[in-house]
């Protein structure tokens, strides 16, 4: 079966929205009113991977852009990046592992764990206007909890 993708936005548990910061980076900041239109709309694809009731493997692309969040080693550290792909081949059901995140729902929050690097999560800083990154700690200063708002195509 072909891969199905649904559009969504994300906010961290402090209600910060995600926006583009240059061509290959996301940052998190509080938005309101008309500024909400700046927030990134993701195309979330349901991809192949280990699955349970609370854990669903997904890929997070930027809507109508050939950019996907991916997890790679940089200087021996798991790092989040926006990676450009060939739009003729993506999205696909069997995404490379660096593109796959385990969407985990715990109580009323979502976490996005890297499939490539277990226990590393999409994270934001407490501070405003800082890059979205891959963090290796939960429950510390950095924020790993999100809510998702699906939006019409």
């Amino acid at each position: 079966a072909p891969v199905r993708s649904l559009n969504c936005t994300l906010r961290d548990s402090q209600q910060k929205s995600l926006v583009m910061s240059g061509p290959y980076e996301l940052k998190a900041l509080h938005l309101q009113g008309q500024d909400m239109e700046q927030q990134v709309v993701f195309s979330m694809s349901f991809v192949q991977g280990e699955e349970s009731n609370d854990k669903i493997p997904v890929a997070l692309g930027l809507k109508e852009k050939n950019l996907y969040l991916s997890c790679v080693l940089k200087d021996d550290k798991p790092t989040l990046q926006l990676e450009s792909v060939d739009p003729k081949n993506y999205p696909k059901k069997k995404m490379e592992k660096r593109f796959v995140f385990n969407k985990i729902e715990i109580n009323n929050k979502l976490e996005f764990e890297s499939a490539q690097f277990p226990n590393w999560y999409i994270s934001t800083s407490q501070a405003e206007n800082m890059p979205v990154f891959l963090g290796g700690t939960k429950g510390g200063q950095d924020i790993t909890d999100f809510t998702m708002q699906f939006v019409s195509s």
């Epitope: 009731n53 009323n108 929050k109 979502l110 809510t147 708002q149 699906f150 195509s153």
Partner: antibody
Framework: EVQLVESGGGLVQPGGSLRLSCAAS????????MSWVRQAPGKRLEWVAY????????YFPDTVKGRFTISRDNAKNTLYLQMNSLRAEDTAVYYC????????????WGQGTLVTVSS | DIQMTQSPSSLSASVGDRVTITCRTS??????LTWYQQKLGKAPQLLVY???TLADGVPSRFSGSGSGTQFTLTISSLQPEDFANYYC?????????FGQGTKVEIK
């Protein structure tokens, strides 16, 4: 046996508010995504709100966005739909429905509660 | 939004008849289609999902087929309890929309 029982419907004036409830039993409510679907007289079914099992994900179509909110209390096995700024076109039978985990089909529905918006 | 068009909007048939209802979509939804049955004054009930998979407890006289943009629900031998409204729904992209319904009446 899966049971979904809606309540809270009634007559409300345009611009008014109403809160619908759906009491669930016969299954582990906290493990299922839930939705509200409505059916206006003589019209097709319309999906109006979605919430994931833990409440971390939601969806509203443009027709109700900004006016309706969906929530759930997993400890009480109850789903809610808060409807504000109601319009005549919101008049419908409102059903709560249990949904497959990956945002797909509705496998069980309640019997519905009628909401009438009229002055 | 993907538009769903059912045909016919109503039909009259007799017990034992073979009945076919069609659902067309404005875009390719692959096999992401569901069929529901709704009896008067009752809640809809799931009949078929993924275009052709019968839901638990649904009699084998019901079957679904199709993919892409054209789908059919077939009742091989209509029974008295099958007189109802039937709706298709896609779940390929948001919003998941329903067809306008097909009313199956007694001839």
């Amino acid at each position: 046996e899966v049971q979904l029982v809606e309540s809270g419907g009634g007559l409300v004036q345009p611009g008014g508010s109403l809160r619908l409830s759906c009491a669930a039993s016969g299954f582990d409510f906290s493990r299922y995504d839930m939705s509200w679907v409505r059916q206006a007289p003589g019209k097709r079914l319309e999906w109006v709100a979605y919430i994931s099992s833990g409440g971390g994900s939601t969806y509203f179509p443009d027709t109700v966005k900004g006016r309706f909110t969906i929530s759930r209390d997993n400890a009480k096995n109850t789903l809610y739909l808060q409807m504000n700024s109601l319009r005549a076109e919101d008049t419908a039978v409102y059903y709560c429905a249990r949904q497959n985990k990956k945002l797909t089909w509705f496998d069980y529905w309640g019997q519905g509660t009628l909401v009438t918006v009229s002055s | 939004d993907i538009q769903m068009t059912q045909s016919p909007s109503s039909l009259s048939a007799s017990v034992g008849d073979r009945v076919t209802i069609t659902c067309r979509t404005s875009g390719n939804i692959h096999n992401y289609l569901t069929w529901y049955q709704q009896k008067l004054g009752k809640a809809p009930q799931l009949l078929v999902y993924n275009a052709k998979t019968l839901a638990d407890g649904v009699p084998s006289r019901f079957s679904g087929s199709g993919s892409g943009t054209q789908f059919t629900l077939t009742i091989s031998s209509l029974q008295p309890e099958d007189f109802a409204n039937y709706y298709c729904q896609h779940f390929w992209s948001l919003p998941f929309t329903f067809g306008q319904g097909t009313k199956v009446e007694i001839k």
